[in-house]
């Protein structure tokens, strides 16, 4: 039975050029967490955390993706392109897969402001 | 389709570093999904895992080998490299390089393996 | 390590015959990490299962895997004359490290 929930920064916003955080946060669970998926809107993975050989960054994003912090991922160098759904992926034994969903919008303004709050989706 | 082609010496003499090179074509070694390995099978005898590499350079190796083994990566060839040094008798085996899913989770296992290469250790 | 035993060493079958090729982990493995492979004489293996149960590409349905924990299972429902080699299983987990079993030679009787 899976007693978990996947806390997200749900929809956030953040200029372009700059940089972003995509955190999720797995809770109400003793589960153990095999590997962390990052997935952008067009399901192409951006970045893998496995809990036994660490962070793996694809090769269309080793430039601006950093890991960190945590199980989280920073997206730096921002474009317009990368407004979108990402999608964290909890695999966990023996509970199984959980999935978070955020919305990132890239916003040309200076003064595009970036929400950090966690939401459960 | 994917392919994967050792290449290296046949001989080499004991106490010596053995060194074979894999070389992958039709797909990019810096696919984000899969390590690449190296699996070696004595004459005979069964199959022992080496170690695998990312495309990054991340490794992990077989701990009963690790002291004697390098694994490197060379993205701009589209190959990955075995090192193993100090080789006695008992290294001479075929070795086999093969695409490795680790990070696949429920698919975990070597999907795509090379024809193989002999390398025999002796004087 | 996980040491996996196959069983038995060789199986003296005929063609039509169903094969029931056994693997027993030394320690539970996570049935999403136990793979089967087929080797002929003079190639390299190839990937038949994954996941316990799963068929790789191109992999008759004659060929299906099952089991869990420390048991598992390969079954050949009918033997081809193609289907007579060496099989091996694999568990693949990181630390304790990947391992193979001993294999076992599928022989025509």
């Known amino acids: 039975m899976m007693t978990g929930t996947i806390e997200t920064t749900g929809n956030i916003s953040a200029k372009k050029g700059g940089s972003v955080i995509l955190q999720c946060h797995l809770s109400s669970t003793m589960a153990q967490v095999t590997q962390v998926n990052w997935e952008q809107h067009d399901h192409s993975l951006l970045a893998i955390r496995n809990a036994e050989l660490g962070w793996h960054i694809y090769p269309a994003f080793k430039d601006r993706v950093a890991p960190g912090p945590g199980l989280g991922l920073t997206l730096q160098s921002l474009t317009m392109n990368d407004t979108g759904e990402y999608f964290c992926t909890y695999h966990t034994y023996p509970d199984g897969t959980y999935r978070g969903r955020i919305f990132l919008e890239v916003l040309e303004s200076s003064v595009a402001e970036h929400s950090a709050r966690f939401q459960i989706p | 389709q994917l392919q994967l082609q050792e290449s290296g010496p046949g001989l080499v003499k004991p106490s010596e570093t053995l060194s074979l090179t894999c070389t992958v074509s039709g797909g990019s070694i810096e696919s984000g999904s899969y390590y690449w390995g190296w699996i070696r099978q004595p004459p005979g005898k069964g199959l022992e895992w080496i170690g695998s590499?990312?495309?990054?350079?991340?490794?992990y190796y077989n701990p009963s080998l690790k002291s004697r083994v390098t694994i490197s990566v060379d993205t701009s060839k589209n190959q990955f490299s075995l090192k193993l040094s100090s080789v006695t008798a008992a290294d001479t085996a075929v070795y086999y390089c093969?695409?490795?899913?680790?990070?696949?989770?429920?698919?975990?296992?070597?999907?795509?393996w090379g024809q193989g290469t002999m390398v025999t250790v002796s004087s | 390590e996980i040491v996996l035993t196959q069983s038995p060493g060789t199986l003296s079958l005929s063609p039509g015959e169903r094969a029931t090729l056994s693997c027993r982990a030394s320690?539970?493995?996570?049935?999403?990490?136990l793979a089967w492979y087929q080797q002929k004489p003079g190639q390299a293996p190839r990937l038949l299962i994954y996941g316990a149960s799963s068929r790789a590409t191109g992999i008759p349905d004659r060929f299906s895997g099952s089991g869990s924990g420390t048991d598992f299972t390969l079954t050949i429902s009918r033997l081809e004359p193609e289907d007579f080699a060496v099989y091996y299983c694999q568990q693949h987990t990181v630390r304790p490290p990947l391992t193979f079993g001993g294999g076992t030679k599928v022989e025509i009787k």
């Open positions: 320690q539970s493995v996570s049935s999403s990490y």
């Open positions: 590499i990312y495309y990054s350079g991340g490794t």
């Open positions: 093969a695409r490795d899913g680790v990070l696949t989770l429920n698919k975990r296992s070597f999907d795509i």
